[in-house]
C-alpha cells in the first residue's frame, strides 16, 4: 500500500511523528549539532515505523537546505534482506552512514567540514518492497560550523581625487570583528560593513582614505582565534604598490 506523509507533529526534541490506527512513524533528530571547520560531525537520526519485520528494499537519504526538495548529499540502498546499505551518492566523498538503517538508524558523519556546510540537514527513509512507504524529517538538524577567522582578501584600490582606500575581507563563525592599524591610524574599526548578502560568514572592513605611506594591517578576531594580514602603500609619483 502507498502512503505519503503530510501531517506531522513535532515536540521540542525534534521528534517527528505520524500516527494512524496501529501505525506509527517517527524520526528523532537533535535540533542542532556544532563542530569546527576541518573537523568531522555526526548528524544523529533514528526512526520508528509501523511495518514490523520489514526486510525489503530500503533507501536512506540525506538532504541539505530544505526538506523534500533540497539537494541530496547522501544516498544509499539496501537490497531485500541485506543489511549492507550500498552508497550511491556521497557529496565530495565526505558523507558516511554511521547508523544501520535496518536497525532504524540513519546517523551520518560529515568529514572535513567547511563553513559552506553550515545548513540544515534532513534524513529520509524509503521502503520499496511489498510495502511502499517513506518518511522524512521535516525540521531536520542544523549543522552549525564554527571557524577561526581567515582573511580571504586584502587590497589597496584607487579612489577619487588621487587617493587610495584599503579593503579587508575575512570569514569566520562567529563572524569576526575587523580592525585596521597603520600609519597615523592607531587601531580603528574603520567602517566595518555588515556581512555580505548571501555570504553570512564574510565581513568586510574599509579604510576609506590612506593618508600616509607605510604598512596597513587588518586584524580579524573571534572567539576561536585571530588572523592578520598587511598591505603596503608606497606612492611614487601617484602610483601605488600593494603586497600582502
Amino acid at each position: 500500500f502507498v502512503r505519503t506523509k503530510i501531517d506531522t507533529t513535532e515536540n521540542l526534541l525534534n521528534t517527528e511523528v505520524h500516527s494512524s490506527p496501529a501505525q506509527r512513524w517517527s524520526m528523532q533528530v537533535p535540533p542542532e549539532v556544532s563542530a569546527e571547520a576541518g573537523d568531522a560531525a555526526v548528524l544523529p537520526c533514528t526512526f520508528t515505523h509501523p511495518h514490523r519485520h520489514y526486510d525489503g528494499p530500503l533507501t536512506a537519504i540525506w538532504r541539505a537546505g530544505e526538506p523534500y526538495a533540497g539537494p541530496q548529499v547522501f544516498r544509499c540502498a539496501a537490497a531485500r534482506g541485506s543489511e549492507l546499505c550500498q552508497t550511491a551518492l556521497s557529496l565530495h566523498g565526505r558523507f558516511r552512514l554511521l547508523g544501520n538503517p535496518r536497525r532504524n538508524d540513519l546517523s551520518l558523519r560529515v568529514e572535513r567540514l567547511a563553513l559552506a556546510d553550515d545548513r540544515r540537514y534532513f534524513c529520509r527513509v524509503e521502503f520499496a518492497g511489498d510495502v511502499h512507504d517513506r518518511y522524512e524529517s521535516r525540521h531536520g538538524v542544523r549543522l552549525h560550523v564554527t571557524a577561526a577567522p581567515r582573511i580571504v582578501n586584502i587590497s589597496v584600490l584607487p579612489s577619487p581625487a588621487h587617493a587610495f582606500r584599503a579593503l579587508c575581507t575575512a570569514e569566520g563563525e562567529p563572524p569576526p570583528a575587523l580592525a585596521w592599524s597603520g600609519p597615523a591610524l592607531g587601531n580603528s574599526l574603520a567602517a566595518v560593513r555588515s556581512p555580505r548578502e548571501g555570504h553570512g560568514h564574510l565581513v568586510t572592513a574599509e579604510l576609506p582614505a590612506l593618508t600616509h605611506d607605510g604598512r596597513y594591517t587588518c586584524t580579524a578576531a573571534n572567539s576561536l582565534g585571530r588572523s592578520e594580514a598587511s598591505v603596503y602603500l608606497f606612492r611614487f609619483h601617484g602610483a601605488s604598490g600593494a603586497s600582502t
Partner: antibody, heavy 120, light 108 residues
Framework: QVQLVQSGGGVVQPGRSLRLSCAAS????????MHWVRQAPGKGLEWVAV????????YYADSVKGRFTISRDNSKNTLYLQMNSLRAEDTAVYYC?????????????WGQGTLVTVSS | QSVLTQPPSVSVAPGKTARITCGGN??????VHWYQQKPGQAPVLVIY???DRPSGIPERFSGSNSGNTATLTISRVEAGDEADYYC???????????FGGGTKLTVL
Amino acid sequence: QVQLVQSGGGVVQPGRSLRLSCAASGFTFSSYAMHWVRQAPGKGLEWVAVISYDGSNKYYADSVKGRFTISRDNSKNTLYLQMNSLRAEDTAVYYCAREGGSYYGYFDYWGQGTLVTVSS
Amino acid sequence: QSVLTQPPSVSVAPGKTARITCGGNNIGSKSVHWYQQKPGQAPVLVIYDDSDRPSGIPERFSGSNSGNTATLTISRVEAGDEADYYCQVWDSSSDHRVFGGGTKLTVL
C-alpha cells in the same frame, strides 16, 4: 595527521586485570567508532570489540564477552580496554583502530600495538 | 557468523601478478576490506569496500568481489610487497568484524 598512541601493556598473571589505553589525535575522535583488534604470537588478526562514536553501542567477540569492557572518554580523546579475568590465551599484541568507513566499515588507522603477556 | 578462508601462502616472482583469495558464503553481498602487515608492524589498509584504494596505496593493488570469493590482486609484484595479507568483513547478524586467517605472500 591521524595518530593512535597506545599504552598499558605488560606482563600479568592469569586471573588478574589490565587496562589498555589508546590516545587519539589529528581527527575528531568523537565522530568515529573505535575498535580493539589483537594478534597472538605467530597467529592472525582477531577482532576484539567495537564502541560507537558516542559510546552508546558496544559489541564484543565471543572469546572476550563478559571479561573485557571497551569504553571511551571523548573529552580526553582516549579509548580504553579493561581486561579482567585474563587467561593465557589472551596473550597477544593488542591494536586500537579507527573505523574509517560506514557502520560496516574498515580500519583505516591503527595504533602501534601493545603486548599483553598473561603468564604465571 | 561469517567464516573467511584464505590460502596460508602464495608465492610469486618479481614483476608477476599475485592473487590472494578470500572465500566465504555469499561474500559477494558483503563489503570486503584487505590489510597488509609486515613483520613487527601494525596492519595497513590496502583495499576497502571490495575495490577502493586508500590514498598512498599504489595502483598495482586492486580488489574484486563476487559470488563466494573476494580477490586481492597485486600486479607487477615487488620485493617490498612481501607481507601477510588479511581480508575482513562485517558480520551483520552479530555486528562483529571478522578477519580471514591471513595469507603470507612470498616474493621469490
